[in-house]
């Protein structure tokens, strides 16, 4: 059985204020079962950006159909980018646990930075 890997292909993503940013993340295995979450930053103070399982994230949409039973693409789009959105974004797989899910594996992260405004 293949060991799950989290693939975030872009190390750096340059974005423009007001535009939509796409953060890519794919997994190489459906197992172990458990949700995928997106965070900005690391450690206890990291900010939850998107939770596959629950929550309301009005600026975030998924690129793929996460209700597919064989979905391995957890890429997201963040709309209406502002300077406050800069930082490093991590795609994180949790495996189910009781009473809490357990962090299983994180992607390497994608740094989102502001690019020069088009002239």
């Amino acid at each position: 059985e293949e060991e799950l890997q989290m693939i975030q292909p872009e190390k750096l993503l340059l974005v423009t204020v007001g535009k939509t940013a796409t953060l890519h993340c794919t997994v190489t295995s459906l197992l172990p079962v458990g949700p995928v979450l997106w965070f900005r930053g690391v450690g206890p103070g990291r900010e939850l950006i998107y939770n596959q399982k629950e929550g309301h994230f009005p600026r975030v949409t998924t690129v793929s159909d996460l209700t597919k039973r064989n979905n391995m693409d957890f890429s997201i789009r963040i709309s209406s980018i502002t300077p406050a959105d800069v930082g490093t974004y991590y795609c994180v797989k949790f495996r189910k646990g009781s009473p809490e899910n357990v962090e299983f594996k994180s992607g390497p992260g994608t740094e989102m930075a502001l690019g020069a405004k088009p002239s």
Epitope: L30, L31, P32, Q52, D65, T67, K68, S98, P99
Partner: antibody, heavy 117, light 107 residues
């Protein structure tokens, strides 16, 4: 309130077809995967088919090639086309809303399909 | 296949546990479905191993460990008499399966 209302069941002869419908309300249908689950008389529950919000389909082996699940997100309706029916398909057919991990949280009242010669 | 006891009985107010075995916890999520009588609409009492829908009383709880899921009813009531089906989603086959059902009798 979440509501799932099945229709389209009836009495048919072996080899005939039916189209079952499930009209939903109370949630954003286009965002959820849905499934059909059946229960034969005196028996337990059996998952039949599922469909993702975008239309990817899944079936139990015993109905592959005979049953077709579909959805019309503009009409908030789930369908199950059942062909080449046999006596073993006699059951109450329930539609159910899937959770994020493909279990079920809401169920309809069911529609009865009876296959008899 | 998921295996659960055919029947369980409990005294009023007692704690009752119904088990469901046969799946691998790393590839399965479990749910529990209550059917008051054969042919009536099932009601989900637990999904995702241990999550309870908002309209289900807190006396219902669920857990899963290894190859076994457990439904616990703490302080069982007469209205809890029903058939309880465990169900699982298998992430390796994309299929849902159900146990044969457990009939709960409250004495």
């Amino acid at each position: 309130d979440v509501q799932l209302v099945e229709s389209g069941g009836g009495v048919v002869r072996p080899g005939e077809s039916l189209r079952l419908s499930c009209a939903v309300s109370g949630f954003r249908f286009s965002s959820y995967a849905m499934s059909w689950v059946r229960q034969a008389p005196g028996k337990g529950l059996e998952w039949v088919s599922g469909i993702s919000s975008g239309g990817d389909t899944y079936y139990v082996d015993s109905v592959k090639g005979r049953f077709t699940i579909s959805r019309d997100n503009s009409k908030n309706t789930l369908y199950l086309q059942v062909n080449s029916l046999t006596a073993e398909d006699t059951a109450i057919y329930y539609c159910a809303r899937e959770t994020w991990n493909h279990l079920f949280d809401y169920w309809g009242l069911g529609t009865l399909v009876t296959v008899s010669s | 296949a998921l295996t659960q006891p055919a029947s369980v009985s409990a005294d009023l107010g007692e704690t009752v546990k119904i088990t469901c075995s046969g799946g691998d916890s790393s590839s399965h999520y479990y749910g529990w479905y209550q059917q008051k009588s054969p042919g009536s609409a099932p009601v989900t009492v637990i999904y995702s191993d241990d999550e309870r829908p908002s309209d289900i009383p807190s006396r219902f709880s669920g857990s899963a460990s290894g190859s076994t899921a457990t439904l616990t009813i703490t302080g069982v009531r007469v209205e809890d008499e029903a058939i309880y089906y465990c169900g699982a989603y298998d992430g390796s086959t994309y299929a849902n399966t159900f146990g044969a059902g457990t009939t709960l009798t409250v004495l």
